[in-house]
Amino acid sequence: GHWGAWMPSSISAFEGTCVSIPCRFDFPDELRPAVVHGVWYFNSPYPKNYPPVVFKSRTQVVHESFQGRSRLLGDLGLRNCTLLLSNVSPELGGKYYFRGDLGGYNQYTFSEHSVLDIVNTPNIVVPPEVVAGTEVEVSCMVPDNCPELRPELSWLGHEGLGEPAVLGRLREDEGTWVQVSLLHFVPTREANGHRLGCQASFPNTTLQFEGYASMDVKYPPVIVEMNSSVEAIEGSHVSLLCGADSNPPPLLTWMRDGTVLREAVAESLLLELEEVTPAEDGVYACLAENAYGQDNRTVGLSVMYAPWKPTVNGTMVAVEGETVSILCSTQSNPDPILTIFKEKQILSTVIYESELQLELPAVSPEDDGEYWCVAENQYGQRATAFNLSVEFAPVLLLESHCAAARDTVQCLCVVKSNPEPSVAFELPSRNVTVNESEREFVYSERSGLVLTSILTLRGQAQAPPRVICTARNLYGAKSLELPFQGAHRLMWAKIGP
């Protein structure tokens, strides 16, 4: 043999119970001591430090802390140094060294030692990762190193978590003993944070110890808080909230059309939209993700805004008799009431549509003029004016005439035409044609589609000539002999030629 000792490097005991520290030692056979003595020291192996004597086989003298509480269970002659400590209290926690005393100069303190830990709670061992939906084994372990008092285990707060299975007394690697009870169950997300307890009691004593472990159940996110569809007025502030329940907290991401708008590891994430525009109208998605899974939900944002200024497309110039088609369109939310007016008269209207088609079959000159397309919803009204130009051959109006006054004859030729006609006055009796370009004789004035040309003849009062007005444009020409109005006409009627 050789000098050596074997004892557990650590051992535990419940406060108030006892602990048996298993210990064996060896020494060279040739020493052949008649009697083997031994000493157990507390916390220091150096006798010079005067460590508390826990047990000494040669005498009954021990440190006051160990008085009546220490006893050798082993037989030193059989190289067994097992120590029993009774009614252990926290101050007994520490290192225990054995010193063999074989007589003569052969006292040997073994460097191997045992660290005693005085505990008052059972040790609940939960696997490092507990995932919802996956079976888990939770164990309750308590030291069982007191031959006089054996612990009994029971679970607390395990209702609905399955029936415990008692494994019983198990020997650990270094010769210490534990009492073990197992609990098998499939945790749910609701079990997260649940306090599971284990109680160790000692029959025929009042000793009772409880330990608790909070379940840290990992589970995938579920989005639990989300706006329903949101309506917002253009320019207003919009907050979209997404809240998820998961463990660990999820990575929350707000997205729109595949673009990440905001993300954070949090239980809830607010997406703030300042002064929303119609461009931000659409579907927003919240994605919640952790290592155990993901969830996503969408919310529609509807940005409400007044109609944009309508745009008008179509034929703005038409020939009399043609069919004209004009499209008025706008954008708004909600869709507007669209109306086309002409001179305060409603020509066409649609409700909650973004475009309005105006059909004018066989347009006439009366259709020529200014039109308005008006778009309106509860947020506002916008209008666009447009002109329809109806082109037609000249029409000489009935108010065309000649009139004499003293020595002057004035002839009015009133023409309605589009485009503007060229007007000529013909005096057949004189074989003369006067064009509107001859400013000293002709004055023209246009009002809308009506052109009034005035021919002034001086010194013609006594014998007014025949005057023929001809109006011409690309669609045709019309002529009219202008009638004389007033006294001369009547006079002529009396006198005759």
Partner: antibody, heavy 126, light 112 residues
Framework: QVQLVQSGSELKKPGASVKVSCKAS????????MNWVRQAPGQGLEWMGW????????TYADDFTGRFVFSLDTSVSTAYLQISSLKAEDTAVYYC???????????????????WGQGTLVTVSS | DIVMTQSPDSLAVSLGERATINCKSS????????????LAWYQQKPGQPPKLLIY???TRESGVPDRFSGSGSGTDFTLTIINLQAEDVAVYYC????????FGQGTKLEIK
């Protein structure tokens, strides 16, 4: 030179106590253990035990437990043997003897007794 | 305890002659860890304390005449004194210091 000088002879009555001293000089006191050896008149040598002068820890031979106490006063390099409840059979010459000690870590090895005191005769008689 | 037995109990040798004293231990005093025999020889003259002559069974203490020698191993040991001198008259003790220390009963050496 190494010297171990013991206190003088003692005549004691049975039941009394006696304290024998052994003063060391010429070496470092705490580097050597101090042994006590008894020699009854006309008899052989009997080892009583020793005291570790470095740690102050005494070790007693099996026949010398109880009434026999080894002690030290390292400040004056002196070892003491105290015998209480003296009996007639305690009459003997008591020797102190040093032994070298080789220290290593928390343990040591003890060697042969090399220097002895001159002895102290303790007579127990009524 | 290890019992040490010396022989003879007494011995008379002429001056200048050789004296041999034997010592037997009840168990080996050879320590396996260092292969040393934990055995010593002492000389004690009347009225004096014992004096160390030999240790480790064969190592002479400084100042001891080389007429003294020790031998043996395990359980059997011998002290030899050659060219015996008058001052060698004494009681000789063997002593083991491996386990709880013990002495032999002593051998008385006289001049013949």
């Amino acid at each position: 030179q190494v010297q171990l000088v013991q206190s003088g002879s003692e005549l004691k009555k049975p039941g009394a106590s006696v304290k024998v001293s052994c003063k060391a000089s010429g070496y470092t006191f705490t580097n050597y253990g101090m042994n006590w050896v008894r020699q009854a008149p006309g008899q052989g040598l009997e080892w009583m035990g020793w005291i570790n002068t470095y740690t102050g820890e005494p070790t007693y031979a099996d026949d010398f437990t109880g009434r026999f106490v080894f002690s030290l006063d390292t400040s004056v390099s002196t070892a003491y043997l105290q015998i209480s409840s003296l009996k007639a059979e305690d009459t003997a010459v008591y020797y102190c003897a040093r032994n070298p000690i080789n220290y290593y870590g928390i343990n040591y090895e003890g060697y042969v007794m090399d220097y002895w005191g001159q002895g102290t005769l303790v007579t127990v008689s009524s | 305890d290890i019992v040490m037995t010396q022989s003879p109990d007494s011995l008379a040798v002429s001056l200048g002659e050789r004296a041999t004293i034997n010592c037997k231990s009840s168990h080996s005093v050879l320590y396996s860890s260092n292969q040393k025999n934990y055995l010593a020889w002492y000389q004690q003259k009347p009225g004096q304390p014992p004096k160390l002559l030999i240790y480790w069974a064969s190592t002479r203490e400084s100042g001891v005449p080389d007429r003294f020698s020790g031998s043996g191993s395990g359980t059997d040991f011998t002290l030899t004194i050659i060219n015996l001198q008058a001052e060698d008259v004494a009681v000789y003790y063997c002593h083991q210091y491996l386990s709880s220390l013990t002495f032999g009963q002593g051998t008385k050496l006289e001049i013949k």
